[in-house]
């Protein structure tokens, strides 16, 4: 009978562009926060977070690997990528004093999910969540959540960058996380 | 010809680890907010929300069932789980008075998506969104959104817990919701 | 041998309700922000954003089309729909003055993902993220993220509406976006 085509199983009006494949073998990862070791980074470059990839709720599967702050994309396709970073800080000084120290610029918190392609020198920012912080209480905390779909190529690398690594809440795996899965 | 193997439809370099299955029959649910009935709960235990599961935009399908505040997982696998809770409140009293009532602790709002396994009494917190509230206006409102992928087992139950059920905006189905789908 | 049934590839205990189909041919779109042209809209009706659909990170594929602020759904099924809108504004005047201008109502920002069905005159609000704004600094900015799963029909149209189009941050494709994909 020869090699059967995937589209023989689809209704006649429906075009099938790719071979059928099992959902269970798709690359997937959910990474959770760990205590960050302060690293040197350039002034206007946000530092990347590193992650837990196999303890607790964290996992990588089906050739999706985590290494040195990067999720490695093992297969080209459309991926849903998401992250939440919970920030926390102290603002005991009055906002007037703080503003004086940083004129015309409110304090802010930012998360960026970045794609790095070895063949291309400049990273690509896929997602950004950025928020001004004008809390009046002495302790403040809040999450920034991001998630969207992107077409990625085999060999692409994903990382999460933040504006200030010292403000990231690393106390609980459910507060700060990063994940991706092939659709 | 005998039973055909799923991998006959995959390119030769690609391994198929699980049987092919139709997307349309995967367990899925999107639940929407209803007016909450105040329930007794322990001091340090966040109350669970209950949900609409079949009216308006809400639905459950393919053996994903909703019962008594819980989404029941009918099949082991990787699920994307999400929820948004919109909170609203009044802060007519000055923040000084409020802070005095709760010394050293800012008011906050928290959402937790929790997994319960019958064989084990202690719930596992999958996702948490928590935010300090330091609004100065008389009326404030804001959403907390959560979403991520988790490996769940058949029989697991999911619920959404909040720090204060009386602050949840139950007025519209598009403001406060909870869902999950098998990937 | 005739047409083979998709369920021949599933284990015997498993019911398959729909024909198998390749993931790669599913309708998908990720749209990114562009500068908005101010449009006339009715007083209590939120204006719709228009989007980039093919440059940079934006794409539409597999019969998912974008036209005139709408994403067109080409095939019935369950879709995950998401959007983030980053708002930014100035609040140089004191909150007392601002409150006086809008008595009993704090300033707010709102995003709505709306479904329009040609056969039905009234749009359906699928998702809403709404937040009071009580920033005390002179410049403020913050994102609202939304995402959930909905059952859509072929021919449905999706759009993103906002409370004030002039507050939308259109400067970067990673800050404000809109997407949907068939599950």
């Amino acid at each position: 009978m020869g090699a059967l085509k995937g589209q023989e199983f689809a209704p006649s009006h429906q075009q099938v562009y790719a071979p059928l494949r099992a959902d269970g073998d798709k690359p997937r990862a959910h990474l959770t926060v760990v205590r960050q070791t302060p690293t040197q980074h350039f002034k206007n470059q946000f530092p990347a977070l590193h992650w837990e990839h196999e303890l607790g709720l964290a996992f990588t599967k089906n050739r999706m690997n985590y290494t040195n702050k990067f999720l490695l994309i093992p297969e080209s396709g459309d991926y849903f990528i998401y992250s939440q970073v919970t920030f926390r800080g102290m603002t005991s000084e009055s906002s007037e004093i703080r503003q004086a120290g940083r004129p015309n610029k409110p304090d802010s918190i930012t998360v960026v999910i970045t794609k790095v392609t070895d063949s291309y020198p400049e990273p690509t920012q896929l997602l950004m969540g950025t928020k001004s912080v004008s809390e009046v209480g002495s302790n403040w905390f809040q999450p920034i959540y991001l998630g969207a779909m992107f077409s990625l190529q085999e060999g692409d690398k994903l990382m999460v960058n933040v504006s200030d690594i010292s403000l990231v809440d690393y106390t609980k795996e459910d507060k700060t996380f990063f994940g991706a899965f092939l659709l | 010809m005998g039973a055909l193997k799923g991998q006959e439809f995959a390119p030769s370099h690609q391994q198929v680890y699980a049987p092919l299955r139709a997307d349309g029959d995967k367990p899925r649910a999107h639940l929407t907010v209803v007016r909450q009935t105040p329930t007794q709960h322990f001091k340090n235990q966040f109350p669970a929300l209950h949900w609409e599961h079949e009216l308006g935009l809400a639905f459950t399908k393919n053996r994903m069932n909703y019962t008594n505040k819980f989404l029941l997982i009918p099949e082991s696998g990787d699920y994307f789980i999400y929820s948004q809770v919109t909170f609203r409140g009044m802060t007519s009293e000055s923040s000084e008075i409020r802070q005095a009532g709760r010394p050293n602790k800012p008011d906050s709002i928290t959402v937790v998506i929790t997994k319960v396994t019958d064989s084990y009494p202690e719930p596992t917190q999958l996702l948490m969104g928590t935010k300090s509230v330091s609004e100065v206006g008389s009326n404030w409102f804001q959403p907390i959104y959560l979403g991520a992928m988790f490996s769940l087992q058949e029989g697991d139950k999911l619920m959404v817990n909040v720090s204060d059920i009386s602050l949840v905006d139950y007025t519209k189905e598009d403001k406060t919701f909870f869902g999950a789908f098998l990937l | 041998m005739g047409a083979l049934k998709g369920q021949e590839f599933a284990p015997s205990h498993q019911q398959v309700y729909a024909p198998l189909r390749a993931d790669g041919d599913k309708p998908r779109a990720h749209l990114t922000v562009v500068r908005q042209t101010p449009t006339q809209h009715f007083k209590n009706q939120f204006p719709a954003l228009h989007w980039e659909h093919e440059l940079g990170l934006a794409f539409t594929k597999n019969r998912m089309n974008y036209t005139n602020k709408f994403l067109l759904i080409p095939e019935s099924g369950d879709y995950f729909i998401y959007s983030q809108v980053t708002f930014r504004g100035m609040t140089s005047e004191s909150s007392e003055i601002r409150q006086a201008g809008r008595p009993n109502k704090p300033d707010s920002i709102t995003v709505v993902i709306t479904k329009v069905t040609d056969s039905y005159p009234e749009p359906t609000q699928l998702l809403m993220g709404t937040k009071s704004v009580s920033e005390v600094g002179s410049n403020w900015f913050q994102p609202i993220y939304l995402g959930a799963m909905f059952s859509l029909q072929e021919g449905d149209k999706l759009m993103v509406n906002v409370s004030d189009i002039s507050l939308v941050d259109y400067t970067k494709e990673d800050k404000t976006f809109f997407g949907a994909f068939l599950l």
Epitope: R35, L55, F59, K172, E173 | S151 | -
Partner: antibody
Framework: EVQLVESGGGLVQPGGSLRLSCAAS????????ISWVRQAPGKGLEWVAW????????HYARMLQGRFTISRDNAKNSLYLQMNSLRAEDTAVYYC?????????????????WGQGTTVTVSS | EIVMTQSPATLSLSPGERATLSCRAS??????LAWYQQKPGQAPRLLIY???NRATGIPARFSGSGSGTDFTLTISSLQPEDFAVYYC?????????FGQGTKVEIK
């Protein structure tokens, strides 16, 4: 009560195989990883292998990789250690131990629950 | 792999005395170190995790300290039931590795 119970130990000839089992109860089996640890007579503790019951990831002691295989059955709350090509130096008490993870990025935890051990003797 | 070295091999002390056990890693393990106690014929018991945190039900006389490569387990006042073998274990890198143990015996 949180409990781990090993079984499957016994006398086996060199080159033979044995499959150890560890039955868990009283906790969420899928959340905590489990390790096998062994102790030869009069010797110290030696870590053998680890599995994430949540996602199936595994790690092995370098000297044992290839001969030993760790696996789990979440439906049965059970863990297994398949030991092949056994040698005299594999003679030991084999413990399964739960790897507590406190759900915090600040901690890596430790093995907080241990079984009573099962004895494996490799001898001709 | 990371090699863990414990010293001394044996510590002879009397009840009520202070015991100080040392554990050194061949490379940094951050604070990812656990201490276990084992009595003859019994399974080990977790005492300390992440270098300085007492496990559930462990008396306050047990304390841990250190980070990087040098760690210490201190028993402030030895009780009769504390005479046993103590093991350290690094949990920073696979494979997990144990020290060879320190035996605390009655003098």
């Amino acid at each position: 009560e949180v409990q781990l119970v090993e079984s499957g130990g016994g006398l086996v000839q060199p080159g033979g195989s044995l499959r150890l089992s560890c039955a868990a109860s009283g906790y969420d089996f899928t959340y905590y990883g489990i390790s096998w640890v062994r102790q030869a007579p009069g010797k110290g503790l030696e870590w053998v292998a680890w599995i994430s019951t949540y996602n199936g990831n595994t790690h092995y002691a370098r000297m044992l990789q290839g001969r030993f295989t760790i696996s789990r059955d979440n439906a049965k709350n059970s863990l297994y250690l398949q030991m092949n090509s056994l040698r005299a130096e594999d003679t030991a008490v084999y413990y399964c131990a739960r790897e507590n993870y406190y759900g915090s990025g600040a901690y890596r935890g430790g093995m907080d629950v241990w079984g009573q051990g099962t004895t494996v003797t490799v001898s001709s | 792999e990371i090699v863990m070295t414990q010293s001394p091999a044996t510590l002879s002390l009397s009840p009520g005395e202070r015991a100080t056990l040392s554990c050194r890693a061949s490379q940094s393990v951050s604070s990812y170190l656990a201490w276990y106690q084992q009595k003859p014929g019994q399974a080990p018991r977790l005492l300390i995790y992440d270098a300085s945190n007492r496990a559930t039900g462990i008396p306050a006389r047990f304390s841990g300290s250190g980070s990087g490569t040098d760690f210490t387990l201190t028993i402030s006042s030895l009780q009769p039931e504390d005479f046993a073998v103590y093991y350290c274990q690094q949990r920073s890198n696979w494979p997990w590795t144990f020290g060879q143990g320190t035996k605390v015996e009655i003098k």
